[in-house]
């Protein structure tokens, strides 16, 4: 089903407007901001979600060492340009004609330039490292229980096949979830790791994107797992291109 037929809502994206005007009176939902039709049986792309977020009223808003090429989303929110499939366009510009290139998760991967800046292709983010710190607990979580629960969560809630959860690392109180998905691995219908990571990030922050479902209640063997800090690193198939000035700052 593309949306909940009974009351015509989008289970996977509350930032939509839905009406029974699809073929045969079926419920059809469109993302706020872009007006693009979305498939409510799966996750909405991060680009459309960011666009919807920017259009909404403002009040609605062994551990791995990240590689030297890992990107962190320091720029925060912006109103992105999305292609007809809902993916980020490789080049993004703001209202003052400042432009930059982004990767497939919408994170800037070049210095900012002007309208002459060229971004030849949308570079795929193939490796995402989600770094979490959990609140103090009576004891450490069992690593294999934690691994199993996080894999289950990504499969059942975010529809991400466990083969894209490369590893779960744990050194109390730090949890690292490695998502990996090469272009060659991603089949039609597979959820993108960038979209799954974004939904997870919003869930962790208590800003669930799901319609009518409770927020994320993460438990390991019945013990609540409460996250107090999240940091996400993005690794692209082609390393980013920043000037030395930025790298030494």
């Amino acid at each position: 089903h593309t949306a909940a037929q009974d009351n015509c809502t989008c289970p996977t994206n509350k930032m939509t407007v839905c009406s029974p005007d699809g073929p045969g009176g079926r419920c059809q939902c469109r993302a706020l901001g872009s007006g693009m039709a979305v498939d409510c049986s799966t996750l909405t792309s991060k680009c459309l979600l960011l666009k919807a977020r920017m259009s909404a009223p403002k009040n609605a808003r062994t551990l791995v060492r990240p590689s030297e090429h890992a990107l962190v989303d320091n720029d925060g929110l912006y109103d992105p340009d999305c292609d007809p499939e809902g993916r980020f366009k490789a080049r993004q510009c703001n209202q003052t004609s400042v432009c930059w290139c982004v990767n497939s998760v919408g994170v800037r991967r070049t210095d900012k330039g002007d309208l002459s800046l060229r971004c030849d292709e949308l570079v795929r983010t193939h490796h995402i490292l989600i770094d979490l710190r959990h609140r103090p607990t009576a004891g450490a979580f069992n690593h294999s229980d934690l691994d199993a629960e996080l894999r289950r969560l990504f499969r059942e809630r975010y529809r991400l096949h466990p083969k894209f959860v490369a590893a779960v690392h744990y050194e109390q109180p730090t949890i690292q979830i490695e998502l990996r998905q090469n272009t060659s691995q991603k089949a039609a219908g597979d959820v993108d790791i960038g979209d799954a990571a974004y939904y997870f990030e919003r869930d962790i922050k208590g800003e669930s994107l799901f319609q009518g479902r409770g927020g994320l209640d993460l438990r390991v063997r019945g013990e609540p797992l409460q996250v107090e800090r999240t940091l996400i690193y993005y690794l692209d198939e082609i390393p980013p291109k920043f000037s030395m000035k930025r790298l030494t700052a």
Partner: antibody, heavy 119, light 111 residues
Framework: QVQLVQSGAEVKKPGSSVKVSCKAS????????INWVRQAPGQGLEWMGV????????SYNQKFKGRVTITADESTSTAYMELSSLRSEDTAVYYC????????????WGQGTLVTVSS | DIQMTQSPSSLSASVGDRVTITCRVS??????????MHWYQQKPGKAPKLLIY???NLESGVPSRFSGSGSGTDFTFTISSLQPEDIATYYC?????????FGGGTKLEIK
């Protein structure tokens, strides 16, 4: 403890449909997807499809596409598998099986439902 | 679809013997070191029971005489010391991509 209890044996005529139920207990129903697997007499195991109990939609083995419908009722913690246009080759034991935590293994199985297709 | 070739299709062994079953897959089921290969035991008239998941992980409550190994396309299931209650048919299964597929089964009998 986790249990999957299936409906009883059925005898059906060729061309008709059968609907088998699988009632889950001992865990939160929407936390785990449910698969359906069948086994013809003296034969091996064949995966038919899986339903996301969280989202309520299913994906199917192409071999059965168009003939099999998997549904779930969250209010009763029950999954259903309906197979239409039955033929004698569909005579088999049908199992429901829950996904395990991490790697899409099937960690709990129903006891099986024998469906006999005979004229 | 991923094809599973399990061998032997049947075997006869004595109590206390070491028993080995192999499963060869038509394409790799390894994703970043995680092998989506599992082993089940099925006794006559009963539902299958999960013994090994992710190629080598023993399911909770399963005796330690059962083990699994392998990666990529070649996998092995071993019973270190056969017991009378191990008489059953054993199946390998991949869950790397759907349709999930099973090996043809190995029927184990006591000599």
């Amino acid at each position: 403890q986790v249990q999957l209890v299936q409906s009883g044996a059925e005898v059906k005529k060729p061309g008709s449909s059968v609907k088998v139920s699988c009632k889950a207990s001992g865990y939160t129903f929407t936390d785990y997807s449910i698969n359906w697997v069948r086994q013809a007499p003296g034969q091996g195991l064949e995966w038919m499809g899986v339903i996301s109990t969280y989202y309520g939609d299913a994906s199917y083995n192409q071999k059965f596409k168009g003939r099999v419908t998997i549904t779930a009722d969250e209010s009763t913690s029950t999954a259903y598998m309906e197979l239409s246009s039955l033929r004698s080759e569909d005579t088999a034991v049908y199992y429901c099986a829950r996904y395990g935590d991490g790697y899409n293994q099937f960690d709990y199985w129903g006891q099986g439902t024998l469906v006999t297709v005979s004229s | 679809d991923i094809q599973m070739t399990q061998s032997p299709s049947s075997l006869s062994a004595s109590v206390g013997d070491r028993v080995t079953i192999t499963c060869r897959v038509s394409e790799s089921v390894d994703s970043y070191g995680n092998n989506f290969m599992h082993w089940y035991q099925q006794k006559p008239g009963k539902a299958p029971k999960l013994l090994i998941y992710r190629a080598s992980n023993l399911e909770s409550g399963v005796p330690s005489r059962f083990s699994g190994s392998g990666s990529g396309t070649d996998f092995t299931f071993t019973i270190s010391s056969l017991q009378p209650e191990d008489i059953a048919t054993y199946y390998c299964q991949q869950s790397y991509e759907d349709p999930y597929t099973f090996g043809g089964g190995t029927k184990l009998e006591i000599k």
